[in-house]
């Protein structure tokens, strides 16, 4: 049960995380105008990875896409790449993890294959989450650098009577969405990897009658006992059932050869 729950929860958390990464990538509020120095501005600027927008106090919002590719800062291109890689890896991870879910049966898929798929999707989620966190962090660092640069510029060369207020940008909502989403995807990936460890076959489980040399009467339950092969297999992880009610994870799934703890 614990394995299925861990795997299922990992999948759901990753799904939410990837949805968040997609949302953050598409959002226009990666950087928003800092109103500290000019709180009375009637025009509000904000920028995303793909376009910059201006919202006038009339409610009219005008957005302009970055129609150049070569003219954009390398850092912005890098952030775009990281976010896209994160989305692609996450999407593939989701696809893989759907088939890896223990609660979904696809033909006569081996549980060992499911374990491998769970691990693969987990690693993909981890990398996806790291890409998103890295992308958002690079952008945030870029903002901080520019913020202090423009602050320095703001207080120089103002000897004249005319003031020129330089627009400074601060963290937008997309950054926080990205950080949270990346973190969730990362957590989901770790959960999938943990679930994989629980799914991994350690012993062979025979459906045949388990014969015991001792003379005690042992109630036979098909698939209920874990029989050691006797070839130096690790017996310390053996689960001995007392014939009581068993959880879903402990119930043998008949098309498969192994029963994983």
């Amino acid at each position: 049960m614990a394995v299925t729950a861990c795997q299922g929860l990992g999948f759901v958390v990753s799904l939410i995380g990837i949805a968040g990464i997609i949302a953050a990538t598409c959002m226009d509020q990666w950087s928003t105008q800092d109103l500290y120095n000019n709180p009375v501005t009637a025009v509000f600027n904000y920028q995303g990875l793909w376009r910059s927008c201006v919202r006038e106090s009339s409610g009219f919002t005008e957005c302009r896409g970055y129609f150049t590719l070569l003219g954009l800062p390398a850092m912005l291109q890098a952030v775009r790449a990281l976010m896209i890689v994160g989305i692609v890896l996450g999407a593939i991870g989701l696809l893989v993890s759907i088939f890896a879910l223990k609660c979904i049966r696809i033909g006569s898929m081996e549980d060992s294959a499911k374990a491998n798929m769970t691990l693969t999707s987990g690693i993909m989620f981890i990398v996806s989450g790291l890409c998103a966190i890295a992308g958002v962090s690079v952008f945030a660092n870029m903002l901080v650098t520019n913020f202090w640069m423009s602050t320095a510029n703001m207080y120089t060369g103002m000897g004249g009577m005319v003031q020129t207020v330089q627009t400074r940008y601060t963290f937008g909502a997309a950054l926080f969405v990205g950080w949270v989403a990346g973190g969730l995807t990362l957590i989901g990936g770790v959960m999938m990897c943990i679930a994989c460890r629980g799914l991994a076959p350690e012993e062979t489980n025979y459906k045949a009658v388990s014969y015991h040399a001792s003379g005690h009467s042992v109630a036979y339950k098909p698939g209920g006992f874990k029989a050691s092969t006797g070839f130096g297999s690790n017996t310390k992880n053996k689960k001995i059932y007392d014939g009581g009610a068993r959880t879903e994870d402990e119930v043998q799934s008949y098309p498969s050869k192994h029963d994983y703890v």
Epitope: N38, E56, S58, E62, V162
Partner: antibody
């Protein structure tokens, strides 16, 4: 067509209050900001503030913040401006103006209401 | 508050003349986000409300004759009437649209010579 019809002229004593109305027609009242601007005799224009009928959100000129109150009645598509503690320098023509969508500038103005403050 | 200064305060011209009036703001009205200048020009005739002529410093309002043109950026702006017509004799106001409170210039009165 868009029309902003303002209430009639008012004569008030110093210290009194006046409530001016501006009835809008010919457009979706709740979609546009309504501005209030005044013009003293022989003087220039002075922005008082603005209100968004949909949200009730307001923005005032600090000079009038303590005395002016902007309200709307969406059921009758009417905007109101109340000015309290009137003084002689408040004698002016008061205009309501519809917010232009696509620019910050108002594009339709009422005919104006003359307010005279005299003892 | 942004202070808007218009010059000259009055101008005597003849019909057909080319007229230029200026407006200076104490702070830049250029928005870096879209490279637009948030300055508006109005025309007001006696006993009438102002009429919007130009917004974003150079964009003519629909229905405004093309003899009216606006130019300038940052803090210095100009309204030009290429050939003054009899109906153009009025007072012209510039307005800061960039920052609250929206402030108007003192006006330039265009009079018949």
């Amino acid at each position: 067509q868009v029309q902003l019809v303002q209430s009639g002229a008012e004569v008030k004593k110093p210290g009194a209050s006046v409530k001016l109305s501006c009835k809008a027609s010919g457009y979706t009242f709740t979609s546009y900001w309504m501005h209030w601007v005044r013009q003293a005799p022989g003087q220039g224009l002075e922005w008082i503030g603005m209100i968004h009928p949909n949200s009730g959100s307001t923005n005032y000129n600090e000079k009038f913040k303590s005395r002016a109150t902007l309200t709307v009645d969406t059921s009758t598509s009417t905007a109101y401006m109340e000015l309290s503690s009137l003084r002689s320098e408040d004698t002016a023509v008061y205009y309501c103006a519809r917010r232009y969508y696509g620019s910050i500038s108002p594009d339709y103005w009422g005919q104006g209401t003359t307010v005279t403050v005299s003892s | 508050d942004i202070v808007m200064t218009q010059s000259p305060s009055s101008l005597s011209v003849s019909v057909g003349d080319r007229v230029t009036m200026t407006c200076k703001s104490s702070q830049s009205l250029l928005n870096s986000g879209n490279q637009k200048n948030y300055l508006t020009w109005y025309q007001q005739k006696p006993g009438q409300p102002p009429k919007l002529l130009i917004y974003w410093a150079s964009t003519r309002e629909s229905g405004v004759p093309d003899r009216f043109s606006g130019s300038g950026s940052g803090t210095d702006f100009t309204l030009t009437i290429s050939s003054v017509q009899p109906e153009d004799f009025a007072t012209y106001y510039c307005q800061n649209d960039y920052s609250y409170p929206f402030t108007f210039g003192g006006g330039t009165k265009l009079e018949i010579k």
